[in-house]
């Protein structure tokens, strides 16, 4: 049978040939009658055999990390007969390891983030080196990790490569650290190979700083003319934290929040002081408010850093603005009777300068030829007024400061012209009528009505009468209907066209005003020749007939 021990060849042997071991048959008596042959992968190129003795040699430098075993076949032949002495057999040559590979960190670059102020023992990251040497061959691939740089803040577990915090760190002092870790094989014993890696450890922010005002006093100014909502200035607190932890909210302490407010600009982290209610220099020309600032997000466990909010004092000076005159009333309404003489008193308006210097005021009435106003604000008529032409005047009163003519105010002025009874009633239209020659007595020939241009406090009431002369002339009579109308009736039987073709009747119309006014109005009555049927008429004035729509021949 075959006789051999397990074959090992150390890697990286530089000799031209290295004896590995011997293959032999137990039938071989050493008289050189047998021939040994080597077959298979590496035979002749990597390994050779002494055909006489069966000694095997490696003739190439081997790398265990590349290939750690070779399977070859051995033959032994009787030289005399050429026959196989033993059956062909496989055997294995194992390449034994030497410590020729240093540990390597394959996952570089390493970067970790850990919250600032983390307690000792907090895990940061695990680094892992790998060693291509044989882990089952002694300590060639047994690694120990150590810290070359990073004390006293970090430590590394020697066997796992786990990096932990060994001392609290404040991001506001230093926000990143470079830690250098060394991995040594041979568990650090002499002859060990080593590799290093750098780990960038960044500290993430925690909210361990409250915002603080850098200024204990801010001085701001606001114009008294500023509308509500106006931004009058900014204040700023500083927070050493970053990001969300530096977001802050400004506010005004409760007692001071009537006139001003503070809103927060979350982009710039500034506090914007805004006007909440209009200010008046003449009423109050300075204010003092106390502002405070707090972080927007504070986890419960970090409240210890935020016990008392930082405050600052803001002095706000109100700037005086030359304000326009101020009328006592928003508008004025006056009454004046028509027909009052020129220069009659209408009313008084009053405006004052709201500013401290109290400038005298000048007044004017825009676009009016009817009224005047003097420097005291007294309004008088400059012309006689006729209510029947204009019953109301819508005017504008302007007040101007004497010392600054650009400061102007205007308000509406309404003047009502009151009625006096200065118009007598008169016919509501021109009346012209006719009477037939054959008309009987008491026949109604016309109804009349009147109008009065005056305004009546109560309803108008008109009284109708014939003039004295016409009363004596008994051809016609009038009846007052007591409803502001009257009827004219014939007072005789028969009229003669040739003798008296037309009558002019004077009618008196009086109103119920105080004093009462009367007018005389003429009614024209034509005498016409009316046919028996009443359809054919012949009058002195054909126009009358035509205009009245009667048929003529």
């Amino acid at each position: 049978g075959w006789v051999w021990n397990q074959f090992f060849v150390p890697e990286e042997m530089n000799t031209t040939s290295h004896h590995i071991g011997q293959l032999r048959s137990d039938l071989d008596n050493g008289n050189n009658s047998f021939q040994y042959k080597l077959l298979g992968a590496g035979a002749g190129s990597t390994f050779i055999i002494d055909e006489r003795t069966g000694d095997i040699y490696a003739i190439q430098k081997l790398d265990r990390e590349e290939r750690s075993l070779y399977i070859l076949r051995a033959q032994v032949i009787d030289i005399a007969t050429g026959r196989a002495v033993e059956p062909e057999s496989e055997f294995v040559i194992k390449v034994s390891d030497i410590n020729d590979n240093e540990p390597k960190f394959l996952d570089e670059p390493y970067e970790a983030i850990v919250p600032e102020m983390s307690p000792e023992g907090t895990l940061v990251i695990q680094v892992t080196a790998s060693d291509a040497d044989d882990p089952s061959s002694g300590n060639n691939a047994r690694l120990l990790y150590s810290l070359l740089q990073g004390q006293p803040y970090f430590s590394v577990e020697p066997t796992t490569g786990v990096i932990r915090i060994s001392s609290k760190m404040d991001r506001e002092l230093q926000d990143e650290y470079w830690v250098i870790i060394q991995a040594k094989d041979m568990i650090g014993q002499p002859g060990a190979l080593s590799g290093t890696t750098s780990v960038l450890i960044k500290l993430s922010d925690v909210n361990d700083n409250k915002p603080i005002f850098k200024e204990s006093l801010y001085r701001l100014t606001v114009s008294e003319s500023a509308p509500t909502g106006t931004s009058i200035g900014t204040i700023m607190a500083y927070d050493n934290d970053i990001g969300e932890n530096a977001e802050m909210d400004y506010s005004i302490e409760e007692d001071d929040s009537q006139t001003f407010d503070i809103i927060t600009n979350h982009e710039t982290q500034e506090g914007i002081v805004i006007l909440k209610k209009k200010v008046d220099f003449e009423h109050q020309n300075h204010y003092g408010i106390r502002a405070k600032v707090k972080n927007h997000h504070v986890p419960e466990q970090l409240m210890k850093y935020h016990t008392e909010a930082s405050t600052t004092f803001i002095k706000i000076q109100v700037e005086d603005v030359d304000e326009p005159p101020l009328f006592l009333l928003p508008y004025y309404v006056f009454e004046v009777f028509e027909e009052t003489p020129q220069g009659s008193f209408v009313g008084v308006v009053s405006a004052t300068d709201p500013d401290n210097r109290k400038s005298p005021i000048r007044y004017s009435i825009t676009r009016s030829k009817v009224f005047n106003i003097n420097d005291n604000g007294t309004i008088t008529t400059s012309n006689s007024l006729d209510r029947e032409i204009s019953a109301w005047y819508n005017l504008s009163i302007t007040a101007t400061e004497k010392y600054n003519i650009e400061q102007i105010s205007s308000i509406p002025l309404y003047v009502q012209v009151l009625n006096i009874n200065d118009h007598a009633p008169e016919f509501s239209q021109y009346y012209e009528t006719y009477v037939c020659e054959n008309a009987g007595s008491g026949q109604v020939i016309q109804t009349i009505s009147a109008v009065d241009r005056d305004e009546s406090i109560e309803e108008h009431h008109f009284y109708f009468n014939l003039s004295v002369e016409d009363t004596n002339n008994s051809s016609f009579t009038i009846i007052d209907n007591q409803d502001n109308t009257a009827v004219i009736l014939t007072n005789r039987t028969g009229f003669n066209l040739q003798e008296e073709p037309v009558f002019y009747i004077s009618i008196l119309i009086a109103d119920n005003g105080i004093p009462s006014l009367t007018s005389t109005n003429t009614l024209t009555i034509h005498v016409c020749d009316c046919g028996d049927s009443g359809s054919t008429q012949t009058c002195q004035y054909q126009e009358l007939v035509l205009s009245m729509g009667f048929k003529t021949e």
Epitope: L39, G40, A41, D63, E66, R67, S68, I71
Partner: antibody
Framework: QVQLQESGPGLVKPSQTLSLTCTIS??????????WSWIRQHPGKGLEWIGY???????YYNPSLKSRVTISVDTSKNQFSLKLTSVTAADTAVYYC????????????WGQGTLVTVSS | EIVLTQSPGTLSLSPGERATLSCRAS???????LAWYQQKPGQAPRLLIY???SRATGIPDRFSGSGSGTDFTLTISRLEPEDFAVYYC????????FGGGTKVEIK
């Protein structure tokens, strides 16, 4: 798991050099115990081993192609490459890259392959 | 170099049948150095068997390998539709070589 991906031009002119790259993902080319190999397959034919390389740079080539083949490695990019010079139409094939177990010689895994046509 | 000869060139069988594929080496090959692959159209080869008889990860147990020296066999005990493909043997002697392949087609 380890994956391989071939890349390179699909058309090469006769007499020029064919160049392909194999990119390894899901593992390191620097792992011991493996060769990184190129194999080709002519259309409708069998498989032909071209050569392989260890990450140290040591190479082994098919004797029939040795004079025209160069395989190189770039551990920083986790890649290895094939150059085949003086190509002819007979080099038209699907080219595969694969990982080889250095002790026992089996090929696993393989790239999906890339067809290279040699034509003017 | 070691030449591997596969037979038959084509095997026509029906699903459910047993397939026996042969691979003969021109000289003795260590069984540790013999592997079998399956290749489907348009795909890369896939490792089935290594060390002559060990199944690769994820390979169904209907695939088995045997043999030593110069004669090796791949057996598919019961063909499934997805098993119809080309099969190659490969050795790892001085220089890796592949057999010419056996095509297993549906009868």
């Amino acid at each position: 798991q380890v994956q391989l991906q071939e890349s390179g031009p699909g058309l090469v002119k006769p007499s020029q050099t064919l160049s392909l790259t194999c990119t390894i993902s899901g593992g390191s080319i620097s792992s011991g115990g493996y060769y990184w190999s190129w194999i080709r397959q002519h259309p409708g034919k069998g498989l032909e081993w071209i050569g392989y390389i260890f990450y140290s740079g040591r190479t082994y080539y098919n004797p029939s192609l040795k004079s025209r083949v160069t395989i190189s490695v770039d551990t920083s990019k986790n890649q290895f490459s094939l150059k085949l010079t003086s190509v002819t139409a007979a080099d038209t094939a699907v080219y595969y890259c694969a990982r080889v177990n250095s002790n026992y010689g089996w090929f696993d895994p393989w790239g999906q392959g890339t067809l290279v046509t040699v034509s003017s | 170099e070691i030449v591997l000869t596969q037979s038959p060139g084509t095997l026509s069988l029906s699903p459910g049948e047993r397939a026996t594929l042969s691979c003969r080496a021109s000289q003795s090959v260590s069984s540790s150095y013999l592997a079998w692959y399956q290749q489907k159209p348009g795909q890369a080869p896939r490792l089935l068997i290594y060390g002559a008889s060990s199944r690769a990860t994820g390979i169904p147990d209907r695939f088995s390998g045997s043999g030593s020296g110069t004669d090796f066999t791949l057996t598919i005990s019961r063909l499934e539709p997805e098993d119809f493909a080309v099969y190659y043997c490969q050795q790892y002697g001085s220089s890796p070589t592949f057999g010419g392949g056996t095509k297993v087609e549906i009868k």
